[in-house]
Every structure is written in structure tokens, then in C-alpha cells.
């Protein structure tokens, strides 16, 4: 059964230029995380595997830096980088849980970080 | 169109080293991790490790550590992998391979190198 | 490690005829799990990769299914230049195992 959790950064804002850190955490669970993904969408932006480290897809490869942690910093943002973002967990023996974040780039400053909140 | 050029056959004798080099063409080298995978004679295929030229760091099958070492040389787009304590098992046909856009996998191959040991 | 069995070892077939490949992992690897043909004296070349997806240039008549555990490699009607040895791989863990190869001979 699966019981646990995917803490998310939720829904965040930055600036055109900047750079934001997408951050899950899983918890209420005992299961060991084999492998987390980043998705962009349906676009693979990154890898991390407990075992084989980090693979960053090429085309993100000048403007994606692995971590903090499990996390994923995406740098030199443009308003093309708004939208959806998943990480997905690979775990054993539960199976994968997915949370999403909301990313939106903003030409101004007003950027500001949403509430976090948590997907079941 | 992506091509990797390896070195030629080289035969050495036990206990040397040898150094088998793989250019790369065709594409940005430092986007991608660049795979040695072995194939003794006659035999199924054996991954060895991977580097990012990238960052330059290495991820090794156990079972391979201390024998091989790799590098990269980002200026001339190319990757070594240097075999040390050489032995009569260790003869084997040894290609580079580009990584995959998606995670682990060989995507395009060099030609091969055939490495024999023999006394 | 991740142990990659493939079966059969080997097969005789006809041109035209339909070919199926199985391999299982040792363990779950979700959809991590790729295909390779080697010809012989020529390096392998990837056919499919995450399980069922075709790079560019290879042909539609070779598909793959599966996950989990339990993968097929399929060839839905066989060409003379598809008589070669066949690799699964996952890619999923240190190390990166292949299975031991299919060869594909001509019946």
C-alpha cells in the first residue's frame, strides 16, 4: 500500500533571467527512492538515480544544475520556461509517486514564492 | 551526422596498459556522456563506465574499477579510456558509445577497438 | 545487479515471418530498458529505447513492449538484413547489464 506523500514548492514565480529551485520531498513513507525525474510537461529535463547519479537531457544541459538534493535548479529563465513541472519518484517497494509544481515567469520583480501544500 | 572514430588494434603484452582513443563528430560532445562497453570474443556485451565531459566526472561498473580510467579532451572533442594491469581476459573488442537524450543508454557507437593480450 | 535474462538464445526464421524477443530483469525497472542489433564484426546498433520507443531512422517494423519486469522486443515481419544477435539493457542501475543475445539466424 502506498502511504506516502509528495511535498511540493507548489505554485512559485520568478524573474525573467533568474534562476529557481524545483524542490519535492517525499514523506510518511518508509520506501527507499530509487530514482526521481523532472518533467517539463512530457519533456525529460533530468535523472537523478540512486545508483547512476544524475543525467541532465542535453538540451537542458547549459541552463539545468542538479540539487540541491534531489531538487533541480533551473537558471537564466524565460517566459517559455512557465508552465507545468513534475518530479516523479521511483520507489521501492511502493512504486512512483508524482508531485507537480506551477512555475511562472514573470517580466517584472514581482515575483514572489507561492504556499507550499501537499499532493496525497 | 554523429560519428565516433575509434582508434586502431592493439596488442600488448600482460601486465602493460594500453590507452584507446574515441573522436567524436557530428555534434555538441560536451551535452553528451560518452559509454565503453566491451565485447569479448565470441561473447555478449559488458558496460565498462561513462563520463560527462561536461563536468568530467565518471561513473564506473565496479567490477572495472581500478582497471579502467576514463578522460575526455573537450578541446579536440575526444575520450580516452586508459586499461591498466592488462590481462588475457582483457583481450576484447572495446567501443565507445554516445549516451542517450533520456538517461542510460547507448544511443550511437563507435566502431570498435580490438585490444589483444597475449605474451 | 540487475539480471537481464533474454530467451530464446536463438531462433531460425523465414523472411516475412513475425519474431518475438523476451526479456526479464531480475527486478523492476519500470520502462528503463532499451534494444540493441548487432551484426556481426559491426558494433551494436539501438533500436528502441525507454521500452518502446524508435529512434529516428529505424524502422516501424520493429516495436517494443513491456515493463516492469517483463519485456518484448517484436519484429513484425522479417527483412534478410535482420538476421543479426539482439541485446536488452536496462538502464536503471549501477551496473548497466545486458542480456546474454538472441541470434536470429535464417530457417
Known amino acids: 500500500m502506498m502511504t506516502g506523500t509528495i511535498e511540493t514548492t507548489g505554485n512559485i514565480s520568478a524573474e525573467k533571467g533568474g534562476s529557481i529551485i524545483l524542490q519535492c520531498h517525499l514523506s510518511s513513507t518508509t520506501a527507499q527512492v530509487t530514482q526521481v525525474n523532472w518533467e517539463q510537461q512530457d519533456q525529460l529535463l533530468a535523472i537523478c538515480n540512486a545508483d547512476l547519479g544524475w543525467h541532465i537531457s542535453p538540451s537542458f544541459k547549459d541552463r539545468v544544475a542538479p540539487g540541491p538534493g534531489l531538487g533541480l535548479t533551473l537558471q537564466s529563465l524565460t517566459v517559455n520556461d512557465t508552465g507545468e513541472y513534475f518530479c516523479i519518484y521511483h520507489t521501492y517497494p511502493d512504486g512512483t509517486y508524482t508531485g507537480r509544481i506551477f512555475l511562472e515567469v514573470l517580466e517584472s520583480s514581482v515575483a514572489e514564492h507561492g504556499a507550499r501544500f501537499q499532493i496525497p | 551526422q554523429v560519428q565516433l572514430v575509434q582508434s586502431g588494434a592493439e596488442v600488448k603484452k600482460p601486465g602493460a596498459s594500453v590507452k584507446v582513443s574515441c573522436k567524436a563528430s557530428?555534434?555538441?560532445?560536451?551535452?553528451?556522456?560518452m559509454y565503453w562497453v566491451r565485447q569479448a570474443p565470441g561473447q555478449g556485451l559488458e558496460w565498462i563506465a561513462f563520463?560527462?565531459?561536461?563536468?568530467?566526472?565518471?561513473t564506473y561498473n565496479q567490477r572495472f574499477r581500478g582497471k579502467a580510467t576514463l578522460t575526455v579532451d573537450t578541446s579536440i572533442s575526444t575520450a580516452y579510456m586508459e586499461l591498466s594491469r592488462l590481462r588475457s581476459d582483457d583481450t576484447a573488442v572495446y567501443y565507445c558509445?554516445?549516451?542517450?537524450?533520456?538517461?542510460?543508454?547507448?544511443?550511437?557507437w563507435g566502431q570498435g577497438t580490438l585490444v589483444t593480450v597475449s605474451s | 545487479d540487475i539480471q537481464m535474462t533474454q530467451s530464446p538464445s536463438s531462433l531460425s526464421a523465414s523472411v516475412g515471418d513475425r519474431v518475438t524477443i523476451t526479456c526479464r530483469p531480475s527486478?523492476?525497472?519500470?520502462?528503463?530498458l532499451s534494444w540493441y542489433q548487432q551484426k556481426p564484426g559491426k558494433a551494436p546498433k539501438l533500436l528502441i529505447y525507454n521500452a518502446k520507443t524508435l529512434p529516428e531512422g529505424v524502422p516501424s517494423r520493429f516495436s517494443g513492449s513491456g515493463s516492469g519486469t517483463d519485456f518484448t522486443l517484436t519484429i513484425s515481419s522479417l527483412q534478410p538484413e535482420d538476421f543479426a544477435t539482439y541485446y536488452c539493457?536496462?538502464?536503471?542501475?549501477?551496473?548497466?547489464?545486458f542480456g546474454q543475445g538472441t541470434k536470429v539466424e535464417i530457417k
Open positions: 527486478e523492476n525497472i519500470y520502462t528503463y
Open positions: 563520463i560527462d565531459p561536461y563536468n568530467g566526472g565518471s
Open positions: 558509445a554516445r549516451g542517450g537524450d533520456y538517461g542510460w543508454y547507448l544511443g550511437v
Open positions: 557530428g555534434y555538441a560532445f560536451s551535452r553528451y556522456s
Open positions: 539493457q536496462h538502464h536503471y542501475g549501477n551496473p548497466l547489464t
